[in-house]
Amino acid sequence: MRRGPRSLRGRDAPAPTPCVPAECFDLLVRHCVACGLLRTPRPKPAGASSPAPRTALQPQE
């Protein structure tokens, strides 16, 4: 069983491996994993006080 690399992820990392649909690349573990879709809520009606918090669709199980 191999150990994961300990170098910083992100901007300096090589381009992630393409993942199949319904997966995305997780820079933390350097692996394609099941992914849900981020979604932004519908705008509140005019006059609403504060913007609704952003939420997400659950990943497919």
Partner: antibody, heavy 125, light 107 residues
Framework: EVQLVESGGGLVQPGGSLRLSCAAS????????IHWVRQAPGKGLEWVAW????????DYADSVKGRFTISADTSKNTAYLQMNSLRAEDTAVYYC??????????????????WGQGTLVTVSS | DIQMTQSPSSLSASVGDRVTITCRAS??????VAWYQQKPGKAPKLLIY???FLYSGVPSRFSGSGSGTDFTLTISSLQPEDFATYYC?????????FGQGTKVEIK
């Protein structure tokens, strides 16, 4: 329903070994990464190790490297933490957790969404 | 390793108060920060991920903001069930690291 159940904790003498199990249901562990996080009595959370069960890739906190081994059996949908050469400072509640991901520009926007109930490991003579 | 420093370490507040907890990363972690709530004897519960996204089922009085090195968790109107300890965590790079926690107590 997603559920994680840890077992295997207990009292062990310094230098001894324990094997913790994390049985998952409601999802397939090979689709996610599984993490162990511990919490010493009265202290904060400390990440211990992670595994991507689909390929067995792992990583460890420096404090446990060379002593602990994380593994997974995808046929049993279960992750494990083998703990050897235990020390008093390893005394803690050990949690397993699933890391969930949502698609974003940088790949995964993720966090640990489901946690087990925890299992207490006490290292004492 | 990236250090996550939370402040304050504890605070006293009343029901209905607006509460703000901050977390500072020792280096840029983009928006790869989550917030958790933990009550005594229980496992942590996810509140916020990717700095500002509310996790499913979490009340909308919780919100998160920030990017880079400075992050904030806000409870807009504290409820009795919100008295707990809150942790930030970065997952920009391994090892993922937690803040030391902020205990929210009843005034």
């Amino acid at each position: 329903e997603v559920q994680l159940v840890e077992s295997g904790g207990g009292l062990v003498q310094p230098g001894g070994s324990l094997r913790l199990s994390c049985a998952a249901s409601g999802f397939t562990i090979s689709s996610n990464s599984i993490h162990w996080v511990r919490q010493a009595p009265g202290k904060g959370l400390e990440w211990v190790a992670w595994i991507t069960p689909s390929d067995g890739n792992t990583d460890y906190a420096d404090s446990v490297k060379g002593r602990f081994t994380i593994s997974a059996d995808t046929s049993k949908n279960t992750a494990y933490l083998q703990m050897n050469s235990l020390r008093a400072e390893d005394t803690a509640v050990y949690y397993c957790a699933r890391r969930v991901c949502y698609s974003s520009v940088r790949g995964c926007a993720g966090a640990m969404d489901y946690w087990g109930q925890g299992t207490l490991v006490t290292v004492s003579s | 390793d990236i250090q996550m420093t939370q402040s304050p370490s504890s605070l006293s507040a009343s029901v209905g108060d607006r509460v703000t907890i901050t977390c500072r990363a020792s280096q840029d972690v983009s928006t790869a920060v989550a917030w958790y709530q933990q009550k005594p004897g229980k496992a942590p519960k996810l509140l916020i991920y990717s700095a500002s996204f509310l996790y499913s089922g979490v009340p909308s009085r919780f919100s998160g903001s920030g990017s880079g090195t400075d992050f904030t968790l806000t409870i807009s109107s504290l409820q009795p069930e919100d008295f707990a300890t809150y942790y930030c965590q970065q997952s920009y790079t391994t090892p993922p690291t937690f803040g030391q926690g902020t205990k929210v107590e009843i005034k």
